[in-house]
């Protein structure tokens, strides 16, 4: 799938975590469909 | 010790279309989002997209959404950058660099210079 | 997207002083701020990331502190190799973005 980031957005960033997506791991599947 | 070894300069003409490698090594390549950035004069350093070797699933920049087409071949532990309809807007050295979530790009590749020129 | 502005973009010192660079988010950014080193022919280093840690083999001469919308690397005690680009980049949030870049320079 595909992501596109720098549209304009009025979403909280937490202030606790990096909004990033974390490191990949093999649990990690792609979704079906 | 971590590599990113990326292929050679490029002269290209306006229109065509051109295709920049990321050799990885020393890591586990599966464990990191591969990472590109374009740098120019004019602009510096502006962050063109991300793919996540195990799924392919991508994060674009918009303004690169176009532009730019990132894939990974697991079983050469490689990540392309296929760039298409270059302009001289497109003339820039052009990096692959890994992200680790905790300390962000942490290993860079040297740089591909790309020239857009007739 | 979060605007980086960087200051200055010129700097002139000599070795053994001590340098501070600047980064100002346009938003809170909480401490994701990561700060870079280039230099001809190697490739780019990082040196501090979230704000303030120093990543693995970087001289404690580096330091990163700040958090929200205002950073700052400070450099004690300038050694020759140093002089150099230096580049902050927020990872709080997609798109990642960059400051345009302070040159440190031999005076």
């Known amino acids: 799938s595909e992501t596109t980031t720098g549209t304009s957005s009025n979403s909280s960033q937490s202030t606790s975590n990096s909004g990033l997506a974390p490191n990949p791991t093999n649990a990690t599947t792609k979704a079906a469909g | 010790e971590v590599q990113l070894q990326q292929s050679g300069p490029e002269l290209v003409k306006p229109g065509a279309s051109v295709k920049i490698s990321c050799k990885a090594s020393?890591?586990?390549?599966?464990?990191?989002?591969m990472n590109w950035v374009k740098q120019s004069p004019e602009k510096s350093l502006e962050w063109i997209g991300e793919i996540n070797p195990i799924t392919s699933d991508k994060t674009f920049n918009q303004k690169f959404k176009a532009k730019a087409t990132l894939t990974v071949d697991r079983s050469s532990t490689t990540a392309y950058m296929h760039l298409k309809s270059l302009t001289s807007e497109d003339s820039a050295v052009y990096y692959c660099a890994r992200r680790d979530y905790d300390t962000s790009l942490d290993y860079w590749g040297q740089g591909t210079t790309l020239t857009v020129s007739s | 997207d979060v605007q980086i502005t960087q200051s200055p973009s010129y700097l002139a010192a000599s070795p053994g002083e001590t340098i501070t660079i600047y980064c100002r988010a346009s938003?809170?950014?909480?401490?994701?701020l990561a700060w870079y080193q280039e230099k001809p022919e190697k490739t780019n280093r990082l040196l501090i990331y979230?704000?303030?840690t120093l990543q693995s083999g970087i001289p404690s001469r580096f330091r990163g502190s700040g958090s929200g919308k205002d950073f700052t690397l400070t450099v004690s005690g300038l050694e020759p190799e140093d002089f150099a680009m230096y580049y902050c980049?927020?990872?709080?949030?997609?798109?990642?973005?960059f400051g345009a870049g302070t040159k440190l320079d031999l005076k």
């Open positions: 980049q927020q990872h709080n949030e997609y798109p990642l973005t």
């Open positions: 979230a704000g303030s």
């Open positions: 938003k809170s950014i909480s401490k994701y």
């Open positions: 020393g890591y586990e390549f599966t464990g990191y989002h």
